[in-house]
């Protein structure tokens, strides 16, 4: 729970948050996600770095891998083979993009207490995983896929055409990693490890983004990434499946693409194994309002994969793009043909549907003016999912269980009343057959992780309650937080307001708007955070507000798809509308209002500053998009269509930050970007700066050499210190 407010007599013993607290991570919290290995066992890395097996039913635990072994290879991660004979140890972690990294892998034999020698793995490896049964290994090295039947065996090479920046096998290229798969891998074992499916991405024709990496050498390096910007040539994707028992027998077999998809540019969006001989692929047209789910079966006679048209399910949006941020993935039931899936109902709310034969005949499982967010697990008799139904707060997440064995199905909220004040935003992690599950509560109080019985939902034990954090916060004057809504012209604008500890409605406070605002995002969430804006409220006496306007998620399609083909309009309008409403509340100093955002938020903050309203005195844009023609095809076209004359070029041109350069004249603008940003290229800020210079508009800027979109490490400290000075100067607050 958030520490309760103390009486004034004790208030002088309490202190405000400092910027140092934030930068040092003094008030960070821990979560506990069990690494499940069966229905009732999980592994966890102890505080002293031993790998410990916990048995829930006996309450006992024992160490399977000592910290000495971990330390001998500097391991930072591990993975137990399903037959429990081997552990891979991961070291020399080297980050690439958001999810991808390379590493060195060692295989440790638990039965012998020694590392497997002979036929060692090459280094560095791009991805490695165990088969779901036994101890086969699949790995990607230099863009090719290899298979080992046993860790000590010589490898079998599955693909041979892998080439840096050209052909990617079993791993995604940049755009698929960031905007479609959201993983570092593009290979999938069948449930019993008989087959291995993988994607091949051909980037040969994709234009390359090139930027300098300055490093320490006399000459900078040039980083080249095949990166399709809006309207550019896209990767060509193919899906193959190989029999891992006899990999050399027929070799990889290509899975056919549905005809209605293959007729024009398309994407592969996900692969879900149903059984060892049935697989489900999802495809998406380049114009992302049509998605096809295709169920394919193995033909033993031909050793090929057959995807009959009768097993194609089409999902189409007439009001926006298909799905939310991504098209949802199916969760198959035990009959291995029917499945549960989240998509929009007739009222425009995302809900769980049960599909047995056709999408048209889908049975709606959940309904209401709220949204189902994630299906965690389907067992023989229960379906566990999360939603924001409870008490009609879109920024909450509770876990529900629907009994699917009985008719009509009964629904129970598992989490709604557990720790009602402390916990309103949950996720869950289930063991095999949902025998047990862990709940991880993210707030609004101090996060807590608990273990539960999957049949009774009874809490078994607390896994992590962040006691040290609770004690550390006892003498801290935390800001107050409130989540409320504004009703404006038939639109509901939810907002979170962070108020100084001694907030007094009769006084006037400077206001900082923190904005993200990207399609299908949500900023107003009931989660715990002690971060930079907490400090600004606690120590510097600012009011901070976050507003979820049009384009944001989990409140229905009307709000979500309002921005379709019109990015940069309504998101900005809604921030401005909210500011006007906040001024009307009477405690905002209307001469001291600022806005800041990062990434999409930098784009929105820039447009808000250049809106000509006179509302904002100053603002900050960190790594902003400045023109949608500069951003990735998969993301941009999903919401904007193509930048062509016969499609949506006009709005691409109208929605740039550069087109509004003149309007920055009457605001103080701080523009910040990392020079090695692989995601939102430095080009975006370079073009803003050029337009401002050409318009003879003064502004402030900061670049971070060799830093990417995250501005991590020492740059983080510099960044927040710099932004703090800028805001304090803007609000005339003494340093």
């Amino acid at each position: 729970l958030r520490p309760s407010r103390v009486h004034n007599s004790e208030e002088n013993t309490m202190r405000a948050l400092t910027l140092k607290d934030i930068l040092n991570g003094t008030f960070s919290y821990k979560t506990f996600f069990p690494n499940w290995i069966s229905g009732q066992e999980y592994l966890h890395q102890s505080a002293d770095n031993n790998i410990v097996l916990y048995n829930i039913e006996t309450g006992q635990s024992y160490t399977i891998l000592s910290n000495r072994t971990m330390k001998s290879v500097n391991a930072s991660n591990y993975g137990l083979s399903p037959d429990r004979q081997f552990v891979y140890l991961e070291s020399d972690y080297s980050k690439l993009w958001r999810y991808s990294y390379t590493a060195t892998y060692y295989i440790y034999d638990l039965s012998n207490g020694e590392f497997v020698r002979g036929n060692e793995l090459p280094r560095p490896i791009q991805y490695l995983c165990w088969s779901p049964v036994g101890s086969k290994l699949a790995y990607v090295y230099q863009n090719n896929i290899y298979l080992k039947q046993r860790p000590g065996d010589p490898p079998f090479q599955i693909t041979f055409n892998g080439r840096e920046n050209k052909i990617f096998n079993g791993i995604p290229d940049w755009v698929y990693e960031e905007e479609m798969l959201a993983t570092k891998y593009a290979l999938w074992w069948s449930p019993n490890g008989k087959f291995l499916a993988y994607a091949e991405f051909n980037d040969t024709d994709i234009p390359v983004i090139a930027y300098s990496y300055y490093g320490d050498e006399q000459y900078p390096r040039t980083i080249n990434i095949p990166y399709p910007k809006a309207g550019a040539k896209n990767p060509v994707v193919r899906i193959f499946i190989i029999d891992t028992t006899y990999p050399a027998y027929v070799g990889p077999q290509e899975v056919p693409v549905p005809a209605m998809i293959a007729s024009s540019d398309y994407y592969f969006s996900w692969l879900t194994w149903v059984t060892d001989e049935r697989v489900c692929l999802q495809w998406l047209k380049r114009v992302q309002n049509v998605s096809v789910l295709s169920i394919c079966d193995f033909r033993e006679d031909w050793q090929t994969w057959d995807c009959p048209k009768t097993q194609e399910h089409i999902e189409e949006s007439r009001t926006g793009w298909a799905g939310g941020f991504f098209v949802s993935t199916p969760v198959f039931s035990y009959d291995a043909i029917s499945y549960y899936k989240i998509f929009s109902d007739k009222d425009g709310y995302k809900h769980i549907h049960y599909i047995k034969d056709t999408v048209e005949n889908a049975i709606q499982i959940t309904s209401g003016k709220w949204e189902a967010i994630n299906i965690f697990r389907v067992t023989q008799d229960s379906l566990f999912y999360s939603s924001n139904e409870f008490e009609e707060y879109p920024g909450r997440r509770n876990i529900y269980r629907i009994s699917i064995g009985s008719y009509p199905p009964s629904k129970k909220c598992v989490t709604c009343h557990l720790r009602k004040e402390r916990c309103q935003y949950y996720t869950a992690s289930f063991s095999d057959y949902a025998k047990y599950y862990a709940l991880v509560c993210y707030g609004p109080g101090i996060p807590i992780s608990t273990l539960h019985d999957g049949r009774t939902d009874q809490e078994i034990k607390i896994l992590e309650e962040n006691k040290e954090l609770e004690n550390a916060l006892k003498n801290i004057q935390l800001p107050k937080e409130e989540i409320k809504k504004l009703e404006v012209d038939e639109i509901t604008l939810w907002y979170k307001m962070i108020l100084p500890p001694q907030f007094d409605r009769s006084k006037k406070y400077p206001l900082l708007i923190q904005v993200y605002g990207g399609p299908c995002s949500q900023s107003v969430r009931s989660v715990f955070a002690v971060n930079w804006i907490s400090y600004l409220a606690s120590k510097e006496g600012m009011v901070i507000a976050l507003v979820d306007g049009r384009g944001t998620a989990f409140q229905g399609d009307k709000l979500l798809y309002a921005v379709y083909r019109k990015l940069g309009v309504y998101e900005v309008e809604d921030q401005i509308t909210a500011v006007r409403k906040f001024i009307e509340m009477g405690f905002i100093d209307e001469k001291r209002i600022a806005i800041w955002g990062w990434s999409y938020g930098g784009y929105v903050s820039s447009l808000a500053l250049a809106s000509g309203t006179g509302l904002f005195k100053c603002g900050i844009a960190v790594a902003p998009v400045s023109s949608w023609e500069y951003y990735a095809s998969v993301y941009t076209e999903r919401f904007m269509g193509l930048p062509t004359k016969d499609d949506n070029l006009e709005h691409y041109k109208n929605s740039t930050v550069m087109a509004r350069a003149e309007y920055f004249r009457n605001v103080d603008y701080l523009l910040i970007h990392g020079t090695a940003d692989d995601n939102v290229h430095f080009q975006n800020s370079a073009q803003i700066a050029k337009a401002l210079v050409n318009a003879q508009v003064d502004f402030q800027a900061m670049w971070y050499s060799d830093q990417n979109h995250g501005l991590s490490g020492l740059s983080t400290n510099h960044l927040y210190t710099h932004m703090t000075h800028f805001l304090k100067q803007c609000f005339s607050l003494s340093d």
């Epitope: 069966s38 009732q40 006996t58 024992y62």
Partner: nanobody, 115 residues
Framework: QVQLQESGGGLVQAGGSLRLSCAVS????????MGWYRQAPGKRRELVAG???????TYADAVKGRFTISRDNAKNTLYLQMNSLKPEDTAVYYC?????????WGQGTQVTVSS
Amino acid sequence: QVQLQESGGGLVQAGGSLRLSCAVSGIISSMNAMGWYRQAPGKRRELVAGLGSGVSTTYADAVKGRFTISRDNAKNTLYLQMNSLKPEDTAVYYCNRWPPPYDYWGQGTQVTVSS
């Protein structure tokens, strides 16, 4: 303290059968995943069969269809029924938790299969 006592090994002709037993104390075997392991002369120890705390089992490819792992909950004992024995099954057989703890093994029981 966990104690594991293997027994039932011996000398047997190829094609013959043996039943190994493992008396378990210090833990309830039925509630723990247990395994039989073996180490042949000059070779590394390997998993022969694993039995989950439910009913899930795993067998090494070399013994599939010939060996059966089971337990008697009342006696807190783990068994390995070995049929159609081959000379290459000659080894010291151990029982342990599955996966094994990093620091404990019993004495084992010797199985020798003559041709």
